[in-house]
């Protein structure tokens, strides 16, 4: 694994091929999670930010930007969308958490919580995922769509199997995240596929 501190994945072009696979040995279904990362893109169309599919299950966990100021979370093919006033184009720190017991999903954009939404109460997110950055999966690790591809930069990605309290979300935003036990930017197992380049993070 690699310590990617101070670095980003650059997706320099629109494509149906360029992506990064994130590898995790996640064995147990997820009852809770928090996912945080930084992104910078000048796309105004919709695109996938984080695509997590399991065998036979599309959109098991998907973070998707519908348009400027609108972020969606899919859990088990169900969707909620939260809105925020944001500058465009501008770097953004995104966190999203979901708790099975309540179904509550919450986005945090640049350290600010958006309106909480609810979906899939009681559901467990399947384990043994294929996780893809740069493309939206329509199958287990494949079937990409150019019109949903990400063009830009992604970094500082961490994923925990718990709902982090606000102070920990803020510490991730400020650059001092807790050790993460699903995906950790400081110890990341990944595979680059296609035209994706690792470069220094210069926009925080």
């Amino acid at each position: 694994h690699t310590d990617l501190s101070g670095k980003v994945f650059v997706f320099p072009r629109e494509s149906v091929t360029d992506h990064v696979n994130l590898i995790t040995p996640l064995e147990k279904p997820l009852q809770n999670f928090t996912l945080c990362f930084r992104a910078y893109s000048d796309l105004s169309r919709a695109y996938s930010l984080f695509s997590y599919n399991t065998q036979g299950r599309d959109n098991e966990l998907l973070v998707y930007k519908e348009r400027v100021g609108e972020y969606s979370l899919y859990i088990g093919r169900h969707k909620v969308t939260s809105k925020v006033i944001e500058k465009f184009p501008a770097p953004v720190h995104i966190c999203v958490s979901w708790e099975s017991s309540s179904g509550i999903a919450e986005f945090w954009i640049n350290g600010t919580p958006l309106v909480k939404k609810g979906l899939r109460q009681g559901y467990f997110v399947e384990a043994q995922p294929k996780i893809v950055l740069g493309q939206e999966q329509d199958s287990y690790g494949g079937k990409f769509d150019r019109s949903q591809s990400f063009v830009g930069e992604i970094g500082d990605l961490y994923m925990w199997d718990s709902v982090l309290p606000p102070e920990n979300i803020l510490s991730a935003y400020q650059g001092t995240p807790l050790p993460a036990n699903i995906l950790d930017w400081q110890a990341l197992n990944y595979e680059i596929r296609g035209y994706v380049i690792i470069k220094p993070l210069v926009w925080v």
Epitope: D3, S5, D161, N181
Partner: antibody, heavy 119, light 107 residues
């Protein structure tokens, strides 16, 4: 097999410094975080800090920030910890330990170095 | 810092018995707890990670359980080679912290 080899013992005078070594073998040294842990008799284990040999990124326990300095030599697959201004409180066994591939626990521990601070 | 409390400093058991070593965290650490075994004069060895997953090569008589603040390492069918000190460790927050250890004595 994966091994972390450390010198058995160091005898140091109070006020002096010591540089402890941890030679890794049997795996790709630059791919795993290396941690250092202190063990004083009857006082359990204390986490000192960690270093990633490739990025040379470090993270210290606040308590040891002014006491310990972590470095690596990639060419010899060796991690180092320098301890400065030694006192009797620093007399302990010091272990290096490798972080697991995916999880934040230590799957391989070094043999340990006993540091004795005495005049 | 998170304090990991192992209230039993010593535990006495017999070969073939079942023994449970407990560890309590001062705040929620989710499932981010590991257990280590340290035999006299040796380095610690990993037994359990993520509260309940056995490290490769560890006999299945060692079982970890718990989440949140309360964790247990259970050894069933205790063997003489299990004579050791057992430490819990949280890896949920920096700095990582360890319990003070529980020494298992074989009668």
């Amino acid at each position: 097999q994966v091994q972390l080899q450390q010198p058995g013992a160091e005898l140091i005078k109070p006020g002096a410094s010591v540089k402890l070594s941890c030679k890794a073998s049997g795996y790709t040294f630059t791919s795993y975080w290396m941690h250092w842990v202190k063990q004083r008799p009857g006082q359990g284990l204390e986490w000192i800090g960690m270093i990633h040999p490739n990025s040379v990124n470090t993270n210290y326990n606040e308590k040891f920030k002014s006491k310990a300095t972590l470095t690596v030599d990639k060419s010899s697959s060796t991690a180092y910890m320098q301890l400065n201004s030694l006192t009797s409180e620093d007399s302990a066994v010091y272990y290096c330990a490798r972080r697991n591939d995916y999880y934040w626990y230590f799957d391989v521990w070094g043999t340990g170095t006993l540091v004795t601070v005495s005049s | 810092d998170i304090v990991m409390t192992q209230s039993q400093k010593f535990m006495s058991t017999s070969v073939g018995d079942r023994v449970s070593v407990t560890c309590k965290a001062s705040q929620n650490v989710n499932s981010n707890v590991a257990w280590y075994q340290q035999k006299p004069g040796q380095s610690p060895k990993a037994l359990i990670y993520s509260a309940s997953y056995r490290y490769s090569g560890v006999p299945d008589r060692f079982t970890g359980s718990g989440s949140g603040t309360d964790f247990t390492l259970t050894i069933t069918n205790v063997q003489s080679e299990d004579l050791a000190e057992y430490f819990c460790q949280q890896c949920n927050n920096y700095p990582f912290t360890f319990g003070s250890g529980t020494k298992l004595e074989i009668k």
